[in-house]
């Protein structure tokens, strides 16, 4: 019988080298054996590239399209084939569907006396258009204190966050993770970075503890 696409391909770009397209088929499908997603840049004399999809659940397929650095005018034609049968034809403009890469190298520095310093790396090289457009959200939570979870919005360019250690409970562990988005490209949020764990050993000076107990 002929195959059918139940949910059309939806694609997002990391605005660097990979776009990811996901779709659902009408029934169980061996995506890599039965389907091919062809893509080609419009407006240029350019190669038609083939993406071999992977399964993403029983009826879901996902394809990772390799591209060179994206520029705003790029537009790709997309053709989904099952053998000789064209199942779906569409187009995709990466600059209008951006999901940034997740920040990396999240590190917690607790050697500053009364401050917890979190640093991470911008996931883009300096010559990428997103490099100077990323802002971040840092999520801090505690497994020891399930009621504690905070989001800190970092709206400046420097990938750092300083938190007074006194705002965290002493003697328990915390976790942090960070994600990014690019305001001027109207992107979705990136995935969260891997989380980093640290132990908050900070104790207020005696005078302050004494002051707190008497007021």
């Amino acid at each position: 019988g002929s195959m059918k696409v139940l949910q059309e391909p939806a694609c997002v770009s990391d605005y660097m080298s990979i776009s990811t397209c996901e779709w659902k088929m009408g029934g169980p499908t061996n995506c890599s054996a039965e389907l091919r997603l062809l893509y080609q840049l419009v407006f240029q004399s350019s190669e038609t590239h083939t993406c071999v999809p992977e399964n993403n659940g029983g009826v879901g397929c996902v394809c990772h399209l390799l591209m060179d650095d994206v520029v705003s005018m790029d537009n790709y034609t997309l053709d989904l084939w099952a053998g000789q049968q064209l199942l779906w034809k569409g187009s995709f403009k990466p600059s209008e569907h951006v999901k940034p890469r997740a920040p990396g190298n999240l590190t917690v520095h607790t050697n500053v006396s009364d401050t917890v310093l979190l640093t991470w790396s911008n996931p883009y090289p300096p010559d990428n258009y997103l490099y100077n457009d990323l802002t971040y959200a840092v999520n801090i939570w505690s497994e020891n204190d399930p009621a504690y979870s905070r989001i800190h919005n970092v709206t400046y360019l420097k990938p750092t966050l300083r938190i007074p250690a006194s705002t965290l409970k002493s003697g328990i562990s915390y976790r942090a993770r960070v994600r990014a988005w690019a305001q001027h490209y109207n992107t979705t949020w990136s995935e969260w970075s891997p989380s980093t764990k640290w132990y908050n050993s900070y104790r207020e000076p005696f005078e302050q503890r004494h002051h707190h107990h008497h007021h």
């Epitope: 840049l41 407006f43 004399s45 350019s46 390799l66 060179d68 520029v71 005018m73």
Partner: antibody
Framework: QVQLKQSGPGLVQPSQSLSVTCTVS????????VHWVRQSPGKGLEWLGV???????DYNAAFKSRLSISKDNSKSQVFFKMNSLQADDTAIYYC????????????WGQGTTLTVSS | DIQMTQSPASLSASVGETVTITCRAS??????LAWYQQKQGKSPQLLVY???TLAEGVPSRFSGSGSGTQFSLKINSLQPEDFGSYYC????????FGAGTKLEVK
């Protein structure tokens, strides 16, 4: 490492044809397109055409009627042929690898110097 | 076809100086522009594509900028190996190149 090596004649008579072979190593012709570009003192660099990884071709309209590009993936060879040569076809002819999704050239052959003269 | 006008045609400079080469397209080519370097008797080498993205292995003293019809290639702190010819190329079909800029030692 990636290499493109060209072979072909240096001197051709007017109205004859030029055949150049570009033998590649370090990558597969099933994954990359190969372009042909020529360079002459009078006209500078001119893009002539391309054979894509799937075997389809695109030609510069100015040369389409007398140009053909083909390949043998198993031998890692691309074949360039231009007919009806005239004196103003005297140039250095290059093969070059296509970079990813962009028609720009990240590796070039060493060039084949052609003189068209009787 | 889209015409590419490069300027200057030739340029003399000394090691350590900063130079800028420009390329103008006869119509909008967005960011679809590449720059190549060619040394005497050698094949061209890709420096920049998408107007500003450095190709692999290209030193950071090279930088590309511009979009639409006006583009430039800047070389900071010229090194002895930077002297040669530079070409721009657009890749709105059909591809065409600029006439080149010859960068010579002053």
């Amino acid at each position: 490492q990636v290499q493109l090596k060209q072979s072909g004649p240096g001197l051709v008579q007017p109205s004859q044809s030029l055949s150049v072979t570009c033998t590649v190593s370090g990558f597969s012709l099933t994954n990359y397109g190969v372009h042909w570009v020529r360079q002459s003192p009078g006209k500078g660099l001119e893009w002539l055409g391309v054979i894509w990884s799937g075997g389809s071709t695109d030609y510069n309209a100015a040369f389409k009627s007398r140009l053909s590009i083909s390949k043998d993936n198993s031998k890692s060879q691309v074949f360039f042929k231009m007919n009806s040569l005239q004196a103003d076809d005297t140039a250095i002819y290059y093969c070059a690898r296509n970079k990813g999704t962009r028609p720009v050239f990240d590796y070039w052959g060493q060039g084949t110097t052609l003189t068209v003269s009787s | 076809d889209i015409q590419m006008t490069q300027s200057p045609a030739s340029l003399s400079a000394s090691v350590g100086e900063t130079v800028t080469i420009t390329c103008r397209a006869s119509e909008n080519i967005y960011s679809y522009l590449a720059w190549y370097q060619q040394k005497q008797g050698k094949s061209p080498q890709l420096l920049v594509y998408n107007a500003k993205t450095l190709a692999e292995g290209v030193p950071s003293r090279f930088s590309g900028s511009g979009s639409g019809t006006q583009f430039s290639l800047k070389i900071n702190s010229l090194q002895p190996e930077d002297f040669g010819s530079y070409y721009c190329q657009h890749y709105v079909s059909p591809l065409t190149f600029g006439a080149g800029t010859k960068l010579e030692v002053k």
